[in-house]
Amino acid sequence: YNNFRKSMDSIGKKQYQVQHGSCSYTFLLPEMDNCRSSSSPYVSNAVQRDAPLEYDDSVQRLQVLENIMENNTQWLMKLENYIQDNMKKEMVEIQQNAVQNQTAVMIEIGTNLLNQTAEQTRKLTDVEAQVLNQTTRLELQLLEHSLSTNKLEKQILDQTSEINKLQDKNSFLEKKVLAMEDKHIIQLQSIKEEKDQLQVLVSKQNSIIEELEKKIVTATVNNSVLQKQQHDLMETVNNLLTMMSTSNSAKDPTVAKEEQISFRDCAEVFKSGHTTNGIYTLTFPNSTEEIKAYCDMEAGGGGWTIIQRREDGSVDFQRTWKEYKVGFGNPSGEYWLGNEFVSQLTNQQRYVLKIHLKDWEGNEAYSLYEHFYLSSEELNYRIHLKGLTGTAGKISSISQPGNDFSTKDGDNDKCICKCSQMLTGGWWFDACGPSNLNGMYYPQRQNTNKFNGIKWYYWKGSGYSLKATTMMIRPADF
């Protein structure tokens, strides 16, 4: 150290100035009443920590150092006073005893003074060493604080640049949002325009619908009139027939009015003037028992009684013997008309059977048998077919001669197995044979390699399950 000064400032604080190189450190230390005892827990050679101390810790440590410095200062002052006091006392003694043994006394005093001076010098050196040690430590701490401050400044700068970046990004996003808002507004406008156009269209359609409704009302009225007229005509015809039957005694006088308007099949319905496709009520031959059937009045001249239809897999065809006997399903959708009705009907007169098929690739085909009938239940509704024509194969996919009908609970096939169990559905199975239009319904892309599907072998092969099938009958003389 180049310089070490001690002075008092205007408010009574002791001032210590340390000159180190080009730097000058000034410490302002407050006055303390009590002096730290020599047993104070100060260790001059304590190892310092590497990392900078926390701020609060540093402040406390500085206060401790200030206290120690203050104590040292007071101690030095006391030491000075003590030396001065001793010097005064000894000067008085010298003056009093000047005459007596001056030489001896002077030597003794000189020795005393030298010893004391040496002692004081040693103590001062020790104190100075302590002060320097503490000053060094303070300097290192200041250096650590300086480093910490630099680090914090760097972090602040980094954060500032990050904030600036975020602000830039924010402004970019704000611009984007604004642009999107503009776009959204434009889109909303175009949507509003479209909505307006649609509203115009809807109002136009509403007016058209109103007109159509009016027309429907008119048509309904006309229809009602026509129906009334038809009813009147029927009544007139019936009256005439009654008159005829009563006038002719050879004829049966009890001809029921109902008998004249009941139909055995769709051919009769067609011939009576009903030429629209739909569900009609048919009557069993020689019976009052009725059954609902779908009539196809358009295909191939009309008059077809639909006895089977598959189209969407909505109806389960794995049914009992009784269900196949009486029929099941919905005549407007998938259904089986019933073996008993078909057997009775086809044994009254000669019927043709047409089987219409659709595959999943949009192709259609048919098989037409010029003579078809079913045996009675006693003979297991055995199928009889003759004269095959059509596009669904040159060979009949219903085995010839015909087989008995089989169901899951009525096994009449020629297989060791139960074909109905194996292939599902009731059918005229052989062993098990080339067809089963009552098999499992498989949707598109699941319809190949299905041996229990809707099969018509001589059109699509073994494992192909068809999309739609219709079996229909009509009198051969229609």
């Epitope: 297989c415 060791i416 197995c417 139960k418 169990q421 194996m422 062993a431 098990c432 044979g433 080339p434 390699n449 299905k450 041996f451 099969k455 072998y457 699509k460 092969g461 073994s462 494992g463 192909y464």
Partner: antibody
Framework: QVQLVQSGAEVKKPGASVKVSCKAS????????MVWVRQAPGQGLEWMGY????????GYNQKFEGRVTMTTDTSTSTAYMELRSLRSDDTAVYYC??????????????WGQGTLVTVSS | DIQMTQSPSSVSASVGDRVTITCKAS??????VAWYQQKPGKAPKLLIY???TRDTGVPSRFSGSGSGTDFTLTISSLQPEDFATYYC?????????FGGGTKVEIK
């Protein structure tokens, strides 16, 4: 008597194709479906697919779909099975067999003697 | 695909012994099960179809039984020519599948 005679053994490199033939005799070739079954060395039987000689209809095991083609030549009563993109695990004995029914792929009552196909680089 | 699990995988027996091989299907296959016999280096031979019907020329010592998921092939009195591997086969559902086989060996 009813007989199925297959072509001889083949050695193929990975990635190659093999076409095995099966000549039928002693019955009406178009009246029965023909199936192909393979057996890897020391392993069980694996059904590959079938062909209906009457109409050329086929059905393949999904495992071989896209790699196998089954065909027939009714004039010579011969069935063929072609397997493409051969791998080492295709090394097996390939059998043709007749189904007992034309209309369904039931059980197999007559078998060929088998054709060993070895796939090795 | 329907799994056919055969057991045992091998059985050691003597001539005259009664041998029973079982096959379990992973789902109901009705009675659509066949049994085949295969000798080393030879093609399989049909023994039984529809679970219990013997094919033409198959000796009566071979019998099959079962329905649904559990099937059995029984050789009532093992003969020297019966030492072979036996396979069960379901044809109820596509694709047809086989059991892993049961090897009948001489004790």
């Amino acid at each position: 008597q009813v007989q199925l005679v297959q072509s001889g053994a083949e050695v193929k490199k990975p990635g190659a194709s093999v076409k095995v033939s099966c000549k039928a005799s002693g019955y009406s070739f178009t009246d029965y479906n023909m199936v192909w079954v393979r057996q890897a060395p020391g392993q069980g039987l694996e059904w590959m697919g079938y062909i209906d000689p009457y109409n050329g209809g086929t059905g393949y095991n999904q495992k071989f779909e896209g790699r196998v083609t089954m065909t027939t030549d009714t004039s010579t009563s011969t069935a063929y099975m072609e397997l493409r993109s051969l791998r080492s695990d295709d090394t097996a004995v390939y059998y043709c067999a007749r189904t007992r029914d034309r209309y369904d792929v039931w059980y197999f009552d007559v078998w060929g003697q088998g054709t060993l196909v070895t796939v090795s680089s | 695909d329907i799994q056919m699990t055969q057991s045992p995988s091998s059985v050691s027996a003597s001539v005259g012994d009664r041998v029973t091989i079982t096959c379990k299907a992973s789902q109901d296959v009705y009675i659509a099960v066949a049994w085949y016999q295969q000798k080393p280096g030879k093609a399989p031979k049909l023994l039984i179809y529809w679970a219990s019907t013997r094919d033409t020329g198959v000796p009566s010592r071979f019998s099959g039984s079962g329905s649904g998921t559990d099937f059995t092939l029984t050789i009532s009195s093992l003969q020297p020519e019966d030492f072979a591997t036996y396979y069960c086969h379901q044809y109820s559902s596509y694709p047809p599948t086989f059991g892993g086989g049961t090897k009948v060996e001489i004790k």
